[in-house]
């Protein structure tokens, strides 16, 4: 067998097919990996060969065609099943070829099961809906090409396991679902199956996603630094440790890039010469909305560091805003003495070391101090 | 936790209708399913239906379809379950049942049983 | 709708030893099963779901495996508390059927 280029097993392509439902599987080539369709590659005397290897097995197999009722078929750059078996797990491979030319690409293909209320290993596409944004529609997804437009299918929506009829807010229109008004309880799985006839045969279609209620556009707002601010001075001496939080809150907006990062003296931590480290952690809320916190680290610091400028900078498709924290060396408590003078000024300055002192016993995260006047 | 207490025991006479209650504590009432099970005595579970509140949805088995009505009062986390034209093979212990999620297919909850006794 | 056929209908067991009860599907109901316990005056309690995962709080001496149209219930080494009637349920197919269950007590 002469040389063919193999690009080897498609993974990124892993097809998975429910038991019994038909499935017409493009072969990949055409899609993803050579630059001419199959039209062009058919009118130039190349040949598409389908083969596949049981799940489990080594041994590479010519397709049945001639299974009853034509189970599987191939239909230009299409193989067919109608419908599938369990058994029909495995890799497939399509092979274009002739004399001269030889090109080929394996992929995955599960045939999964599913119980009443559609749980399957299935991996589900996720459909954002806003809240409370008035009418949104999730539409019944990959059933182009399996009926003439001619045929007009009977379908069915379901929540979870649940029959959509008569939901006073979510309401089914043929290939489309419509939500009156998505809250956060419509946050779950959707499931349309699609019934159509073919050649006096019934057969169905099950497409499942997950719905996801996220923020409203209308009430997404530029990002919201809630840490450094005015209330709070980090004030340290000279070979203790620093900390700062930047804390970041962004709307959630429909594929916005959340960016935060520090500055010091308006440059990038790695652009300055002290030893720096940043963690970042993220958290969502239940509509996708992101609270991020950078945590600027010093781990000795000096004299020279604290009277550095330390900008939070935050950035989303909303804006750009930047917040600077208010870092100080700490000036010694002056002792508190009878000669004082100063009536109750010593003590002042003793409740207010106090307090300070209290502040760092009291488990504050980062070490911060509020700052007394 | 989550809890459903139903109402207690009943006696009906055939041709007439029964009532149960069940209500609900722990989790959002208006967005779990509530169903329906009965048992007749020494025998085995059966579904009868179930209703998802805050959707204003019902579900019933074809063969109580007519004549099982099920409701649910949100302000009071409250499930009920009608049953009319009573006959003696409805002498039965009713169950309310909630699954975990709308996608689960079993009960993880059930309420305490009301036993209704259908008698000339 | 599918039938759930539980055998045997009475289980005679004694105390420490293993108890093992089966439930056929009239169809195949894939992984699709539950499986409960109820004892007299009492609701049913959840023990098994997805025919093999135990639900929360089940000791480990219930296990439960099949799949398709034959299934098992397995308590390992029977305690006091375990004589009760048990009850498996298929949710693979409206509407979900129970069987007729398998009351074990003791010998």
């Known amino acids: 067998s002469e040389r063919c280029d193999d690009w080897g097993l498609d993974t990124m392509r892993q097809i998975q097919v429910f038991e019994d439902e038909p499935a017409r599987i493009k072969c990949p080539l055409f899609e993803h990996f050579l630059k001419f369709n199959y039209s062009t590659a058919h009118s130039a005397g190349l040949t598409l060969i389908w083969y596949w290897t049981r799940q489990d097995r080594d041994l590479e197999e010519p397709i049945n065609f001639r299974l009853p009722e034509n189970r599987i078929s191939k239909e230009k750059d299409v193989l067919w099943f109608r419908p599938t078996l369990l058994n029909d797990t495995g890799n497939y491979t399509c092979m274009l070829r002739n004399t001269t030319y030889c090109s080929k690409v394996a992929f995955p293909l599960e045939v999964v099961q599913k119980d009443s209320c559609f749980n399957s290993p299935m991996k589900l596409p996720v459909h954002k809906l806003y809240i409370e944004y008035g009418i949104q529609r999730i539409t019944c997804p990959n059933v182009d090409g399996y009926f003439p437009s001619s045929v007009k299918p009977t379908i069915t929506w379901y929540m979870g396991c649940y029959k959509i009829q008569n939901f006073n807010n979510v309401i089914p229109e043929g290939m489309n679902l419509s939500f009156l008004i998505a809250f956060i309880s419509n946050n779950g799985n959707y499931t349309c199956v699609v019934t159509y006839p073919e050649n006096g045969r019934t057969f169905h279609l099950t497409r499942t996603l997950t719905v996801k209620v996220v923020g409203s556009p209308k009430n997404a707002v530029p990002p919201v630094i809630h840490s450094p601010n005015d209330h709070v001075v980090y004030e340290k001496e000279p070979g203790e440790e620093l900390l700062i939080p930047c804390t970041v809150y962004f709307s959630f907006l429909m594929d916005s890039r959340n960016e935060v990062w520090w500055t010091i003296d308006g440059k990038k931590p790695d652009d300055i010469p002290i030893d720096v480290t940043i963690n970042e952690s993220i958290s969502h809320s239940r509509t996708e909305d992101e609270t991020r916190t950078q945590i600027l680290s010093i781990k000795k610091v000096t004299s020279e560091d604290l009277k550095r400028s330390y900008v939070c900078h935050a950035r989303s498709a909303k804006g750009e805003v930047a917040k600077a924290a208010t870092v100080k060396q700490k000036v010694p408590a002056p002792r508190y003495t009878v000669e004082g003078g100063g009536g109750t000024g010593g003590l002042n300055d003793i409740f207010e070391a106090q307090k300070i002192e209290w502040h760092e016993g009291g488990g504050h995260h980062h070490h911060h101090h509020h700052h007394h006047h | 936790q989550v809890q459903l207490v139903q109402s207690g025991a009943e006696v009906k006479k055939p041709g007439s209708s029964v009532k149960v209650s069940c209500k609900a504590s722990g989790g959002v009432f208006s967005y779990y399913a509530f169903h329906w099970v009965r048992q007749a005595p020494g025998q085995g579970l059966e579904w009868m239906g179930g209703?998802?509140?805050?959707?204003?949805?019902?579900f019933y088995a074809q063969k109580f379809q007519g004549r099982v009505t099920i409701t649910a009062d949100e302000s009071t986390s409250t499930a009920y379950m009608e049953l009319s034209s009573l006959r003696s093979e409805d002498t039965a212990v009713y169950y309310c049942a909630r699954p975990v999620s709308y996608s689960s297919g079993w009960y993880d909850y059930w309420g305490q049983g009301t036993l209704v006794t259908v008698s000339s | 709708e599918i039938v759930m056929t539980q055998s045997p209908a009475t289980l005679s067991v004694s105390p420490g030893e293993r108890a093992t009860l089966s439930c056929r599907a009239s169809?195949?109901?894939?992984?699709?099963l539950a499986w409960y316990q109820q004892k007299p005056g009492q609701a049913p309690r959840l023990l098994i779901y997805?025919?093999?995962t135990r639900a929360t709080g089940i000791p480990a001496r219930f296990s439960g495996s099949g799949s398709g149209t034959e299934f098992t219930l397995t308590i390992s080494s029977l305690q006091s508390e375990d004589f009760a009637v048990y009850y498996c349920q298929q949710y693979n197919n409206w509407p979900w059927t129970f069987g007729q269950g398998t009351k074990v007590e003791i010998k």
């Open positions: 169809q195949s109901v894939s992984s699709n």
């Open positions: 209703i998802i509140p805050g959707y204003g949805a019902t």
């Open positions: 997805g025919a093999s």
